[in-house]
């Protein structure tokens, strides 16, 4: 009978050896068989499972001239960069006729210095604020004992006696480095060194100190900054009358915020050149040599109403007997609030001043006392908001109306050039 066809007679004349090494090692397993007739394909098994994508090479050498003579078959399995998943029991398998033959096993083991699965990462933390760092290492061989170091000083008296996978740091007041050592029977591996940068705590209690129509004074309480003094604080403000949802500090505003730096102390800043009667959102962050704190949440604030900055424009006043007709236009100067109405005052040369609230109308007909013979009658008009009256116009003389003539218009205020919308900030 041809060799290898009987179950009790294995064709294998060389079985896989053993490989034990550290991660990354390259090694080769080899098995050899002698068969009569056409050489079979050699398969490799790991832990009883066929390796479909094995990096194997098969060499066949005939021992005679005839195809039916014996052949030596050598199969080599190459393991490149040994990993934990490569470990196990390896065997060669061949099918000869209706029989299956399996070689004696060889073993691949991994044993070396600890290997880090997780290492501490660089991060920033607020001063005196707790945080956690992670470190995880494995063998084989196990066990692996960890020793954490802070600024190269061990945090426990010996490996395995302190925190292992997770280090809880109750807080730092200076930028520090952390690493961990992993110890096993083969030696020591040291992780990367993580730098933990200590930033100032978020400022607290951002609040308004005082409000004026074009100016807000704000103050805040600085957070702890460890051993690093604060160098400055940065205040951001944004117009919030577009209904943005930044009250809770969630999204950043869609437009670029206006930014100002404050020297510290004092932890206070006056914001000038603001729009009156306008909602804003403000926030603050403070900076040390190590970097900036996180921003406070956006604080909604609002400038109060002011009085109109100029008098009504284009006042005309004409007299027809005992009646006087006065009309005007809204002030061109900023109203600094919601216009509530106009006040009008008229006075003759020797008569007391008469004051009237016209409301929001921009014209009025006056019934003059007597026969209308009062001389040198003049009229003044002022706009007002909830904050009070704006400036009065210059007195406008009441001129007799001549039919067919246009009513006189008194341009008593120089018309300012209308500037483009701008933010002259503090």
């Amino acid at each position: 009978a041809p060799r290898g066809t009987q179950a009790e007679e294995s064709p294998f004349v060389g079985n896989p050896g053993n490989i034990t090494g550290a991660r990354g090692l390259t090694g080769t397993l080899r098995c050899q068989l002698q068969v009569q007739g056409e050489p079979p394909e050699v398969h490799w098994l790991r832990d009883g499972q066929i390796l479909e994508l094995a990096d194997s090479t098969q060499t066949q050498v005939p021992l005679g001239e005839d195809e039916q003579d014996d052949w030596i078959v050598v199969s080599q399995l190459r393991i490149t960069s040994l990993q934990l998943s490569d470990t196990g029991q390896y065997q060669c398998l061949v099918f000869l006729g209706h029989q299956t033959f399996v070689s004696q096993p060889g073993y691949v083991g991994l044993e070396g210095l600890p290997y880090f699965l997780e290492e501490p990462e660089d991060r920033t933390v607020a001063a005196n604020t707790p945080f956690n760092l992670s470190c995880q290492a494995q063998g084989p061989p196990e066990p692996v004992d960890l020793l954490w170091l802070q600024d190269a000083v061990p945090l426990a008296t010996a490996p395995g006696h302190g925190p292992q996978r997770s280090l809880h740091v109750p807080g730092l007041n200076k930028t520090s480095s952390f690493s961990c050592e992993a110890h096993n029977a083969k030696g020591v591996t040291t992780s990367r060194t993580a730098t933990i940068t200590v930033l100032p705590q978020q400022p607290r209690n951002l609040h308004l100190v005082s409000r004026q129509p074009t100016e807000l004074e704000v103050a805040w309480t600085p957070g702890l900054s460890g051993i690093y003094p604060l160098t400055h604080c940065t205040l951001q403000a944004v117009l919030s009358d577009d209904g943005m949802g930044i009250q809770a500090g969630e999204p950043d505003p869609p437009e670029e915020p206006l930014t100002s730096q404050a020297s510290v102390p004092p932890h206070q800043l006056r914001l000038g050149s603001l729009h009156p009667h306008t909602p804003y959102h403000i926030r603050v962050a403070c900076t040390s040599s190590q970097g900036p704190s996180s921003w406070t949440h956006w604080l909604p604030v609002e400038t109060p109403e002011g009085v109109p900055l100029g008098p009504p424009e284009n006042i005309s006043a004409t007299r027809n007997g005992s009646q006087a007709f006065v009309h005007w236009q809204e002030p061109r100067a900023p109203l600094q609030g919601t216009l509530l109405g106009y006040r009008l005052a008229y006075q003759g040369q020797d008569t007391p001043e008469v004051l009237m609230d016209i409301g929001l109308r921009q014209e009025v007909t006056l019934e003059l006392q007597g026969d209308g013979s009062v001389s040198n009658l003049t009229v003044c008009v002022a706009a007002y908001t909830a904050a009070g009256d704006g400036p009065w116009s210059l007195p406008v003389p009441l001129e007799a109306w001549r039919p067919g003539e246009a009513q006189p218009v008194h341009q008593l205020v120089k018309e300012p050039s209308t500037p483009a919308f701008s933010w002259p900030w503090w």
Epitope: D145, A156, A158, P159
Partner: antibody
Framework: QVQLQESGPGLVKPSETLSLTCTVS????????WGWIRQPPGKGLEWIGY???????SYNPSLKSRVTISRDTSKNQFSLKLSSVTAADTAVYYC???????WGQGTLVTVSS | DIQMTQSPSSLSASVGDRVTITCRAS??????LRWYQQKPGKAPKLMIS???NLAAGVPSRFSGSGSGSDFTLTISSLQPEDFATYYC?????????FGQGTKVEIK
């Protein structure tokens, strides 16, 4: 398999120096920390000190003036020397890895003239 | 030095009993505490590390609790092989110090 084995004289005269060696197999002493613990007959355990993988040492202050722990990495051994011994130093001396997964079996050292 | 006080110094119990041994540190040691079992003529064996972590190969009937200065070793159901002396050890700072031991005997 990790094994630790203490060796040294079982009898030491008073005022002399007690010397013990711990031979470690299956674990490199250039990793982890390695210590000595003793136990007087019928009493509790007392920590003597340790040597680190890098060769630095830490000793029990009550013994510090008399104790030296050293190592020989080429032989994978570390040693204990305790000078000026008295009868109070009679004890079973254990060597161990400081995680205490692995211990020697202990050796009784008697201090007697 | 940190003093470790174990109680009781000895106790008698029967197989199946629940046994509790306490260890008190003279100052806060966090969770830097270990428990050992020692049988006559043998080296101690690590049972619990980090106050609560069961060492490899130790039966689950053993458990550790506590943090700071008060610690407990509990054997939920005493077995014949558990009769031994138990020691606590603090490794928070040098010198490491052991408790004086608790001998668990058969009633």
């Amino acid at each position: 398999q990790v094994q630790l084995q203490e060796s040294g004289p079982g009898l030491v005269k008073p005022s002399e120096t007690l010397s013990l060696t711990c031979t470690v197999s299956g674990y490199s002493i250039t990793s982890n920390y390695w210590g000595w613990i003793r136990q007087p007959p019928g009493k509790g355990l007392e920590w003597i000190g340790y040597i680190t993988y890098s060769g630095s040492t830490s000793y029990n202050p009550s013994l510090k003036s008399r104790v030296t722990i050293s190592r020989d990495t080429s032989k994978n051994q570390f040693s204990l020397k305790l000078s000026s011994v008295t009868a109070a130093d009679t004890a079973v001396y254990y060597c161990a890895i400081t995680t205490f997964y692995y211990w020697g079996q202990g050796t009784l050292v008697t201090v007697s003239s | 030095d940190i003093q470790m006080t174990q109680s009781p110094s000895s106790l008698s119990a029967s197989v199946g009993d629940r046994v509790t041994i306490t260890c008190r540190a003279s100052q806060d040691i966090g969770n830097y505490l270990r428990w050992y079992q020692q049988k006559p003529g043998k080296a101690p064996k690590l049972m619990i590390s980090g106050a609560t972590n069961l060492a490899a190969g130790v039966p689950s009937r053993f458990s550790g609790s506590g943090s700071g200065s008060d610690f407990t070793l509990t054997i939920s159901s005493l077995q014949p092989e558990d009769f031994a002396t138990y020691y606590c050890l603090q490794s928070k700072e040098s010198p490491w110090t052991f408790g004086q031991g608790t001998k668990v005997e058969i009633k």
